[in-house]
Interface confidence: low
Amino acid sequence: EAHKSEIAHRYNDLGEQHFKGLVLIAFSQYLQKCSYDEHAKLVQEVTDFAKTCVADESAANCDKSLHTLFGDKLCAIPNLRENYGELADCCTKQEPERNECFLQHKDDNPSLPPFERPEAEAMCTSFKENPTTFMGHYLHEVARRHPYFYAPELLYYAEQYNEILTQCCAEADKESCLTPKLDGVKEKALVSSVRQRMKCSSMQKFGERAFKAWAVARLSQTFPNADFAEITKLATDLTKVNKECCHGDLLECADDRAELAKYMCENQATISSKLQTCCDKPLLKKAHCLSEVEHDTMPADLPAIAADFVEDQEVCKNYAEAKDVFLGTFLYEYSRRHPDYSVSLLLRLAKKYEATLEKCCAEANPPACYGTVLAEFQPLVEEPKNLVKTNCDLYEKLGEYGFQNAILVRYTQKAPQVSTPTLVEAARNLGRVGTKCCTLPEDQRLPCVEDYLSAILNRVCLLHEKTPVSEHVTKCCSGSLVERRPCFSALTVDETYVPKEFKAETFTFHSDICTLPEKEKQIKKQTALAELVKHKPKATAEQLKTVMDDFAQFLDTCCKAADKDTCFSTEGPNLVTRCKDALA
């Protein structure tokens, strides 16, 4: 139904707390350099205005669209051009072009310092003094670093953060209570961020149809007892929610997500038997829980997929009459039978099936032509299965850090032109797939591994788009989203690369490395490893292991020495010489 005042409608639907949180996220994602205080002031002004409209929907400007209202606020910020450069040009445009312009200026890798967590005592003090401001800072800091973070889900993580602080700040040993819990939330939030970014990339690059196909596959796996009409309805709604969030329409997105959760809980009988525990929770927890609910038990008597999609004499007729519906039912039927496949794999199979029908239905004897299509799926299925086995075996042998290093070497050889920080970030993220997925039961490994890798590689593509330096990466990133991971896996050593000359300063370290946290130490060592590979792209695994072991030994010795500085300045050059010799 149409509302006289959109802003009043959303304020009423969402309530003041969520309304303010979402407006803060929206502003922080658009203008990523502004301070919390600047944004908090704008949020308060928007909220006061919304309340005016709730009181009187006919009041001045209450009938304006949210984009107009928010855009006008952003464009009124002083020193916009000085701080944001050409983003200020967006303000010369009219809606909807102005919002599109803001979206195009979102920066996936803003030059902001890492979000440092204060020590426990200080955190608890500021949390107790003003919980609302504390959580506002959290929303602001995460949103500006992750401009496509799924807004309603960020509210959920803020709520988790709040609950952890409430619990741990009452304990005697705040630090040991907070650290593991907040680390857990951070890890989950970072994964959520890359997954959502992948969804927005799918929407931006390939449109709603591509996203809807992803949703049909994913929902069919999770709800194999829901009928195709139900899955289509859920996929349509989910597509709308994600389109809104990716497009910066965060109030609409959160409102529609709440509606979708309500619908699912009211229609459990026709969706899944596993929803009840989610549906008993309050809104943010309910929607989060539904988004990762376990798969329902598959119907016992599903007929073989071949019956309707290969053996049926009407295949070409059904395909010609309604291509999208027929392919949709294929994707639905195949996905509900294969919760053990990744969504990426299911979409590749659907694409292969479509290509086969396109070719065969134009021939004299279509059934003879498409009769072998299911057998032709085999290599497409085997490839990711082998990838999972090989990589999980390697992870089990090396552990997370060693596995990250193996991936770092592999990817530096594939794309040595890519900047070392990007390679290290990618390898560390790709390496976490082991910890995240390889410990799962066999039937859950493939979907976990491949869909996570796809999301991480999407980030690699986004960062590379800013400064394209590798033809290998450009080639893999230009194709379809579902082909990216196989494309990256198939890359070999880049033969066109001219090795970097050996610079001693790249491998010169100082005693300050000794006091760094373990994670930072690892990053320093991994940076050196990537630089070594760039110097000698064809170095063997043994050579690299020798050098890295020597390096680790050097750090251990010097960090234990009484006079660390002297040790680093005398042993360092010896290490560099030994490295050069080992790689010669």
Epitope: D227, A229, E230, K233, T236, D237, Y263, T270, N318
Partner: nanobody, 124 residues
Framework: QVQLQQSGPGLVKPSQTLSLTCAIS??????????WNWIRQSPSRGLEWLGR?????????GYAASLQSRLAINADTSKNQLSLRLSSVTPEDTAVYYC??????????????WGHGTMVTVSS
């Protein structure tokens, strides 16, 4: 406007087969924007979904796992009606049986049309 007219016996003996029909007007049983369900309600079990059928370039049928072996739902396109057959009934199957059409529309999502319900008692 969609209307569902149910018919069938009110009393069935144990071990016999219960048969109900649901005549549809205002929509087609083979239309591609609806799904046709049977649901029952009893004091002991509450509201219970039994199964559904719908057409999307072929017929799909789904049953509640607990009734899989005893239940058959069919659509008759020539009569534009839905039928339910539940075999080997016991007093536990005593309930009000509803025929429910779920209609999917692009924007507003789904809305349901319910039949008036048939009270079925299983007793000798």
């Amino acid at each position: 406007q969609v209307q569902l007219q149910q018919s069938g016996p009110g009393l069935v003996k144990p071990s016999q087969t219960l048969s109900l029909t649901c005549a549809i007007s205002g929509d087609s049983v083979s239309g591609n924007s609806a799904a046709w369900n049977w649901i029952r309600q009893s004091p002991s079990r509450g509201l219970e979904w039994l199964g559904r059928t719908y057409y999307r370039s072929k017929w799909y049928i789904g049953y509640a796992a607990s009734l899989q072996s005893r239940l058959a739902i069919n659509a008759d396109t020539s009569k534009n009606q839905l039928s339910l057959r539940l075999s080997s009934v016991t007093p536990e199957d005593t309930a009000v049986y509803y025929c429910v059409g779920r209609h999917y529309s692009g924007h507003s999502g789904a809305f349901d049309t319910w039949g008036h319900g048939t009270m079925v008692t299983v007793s000798s």
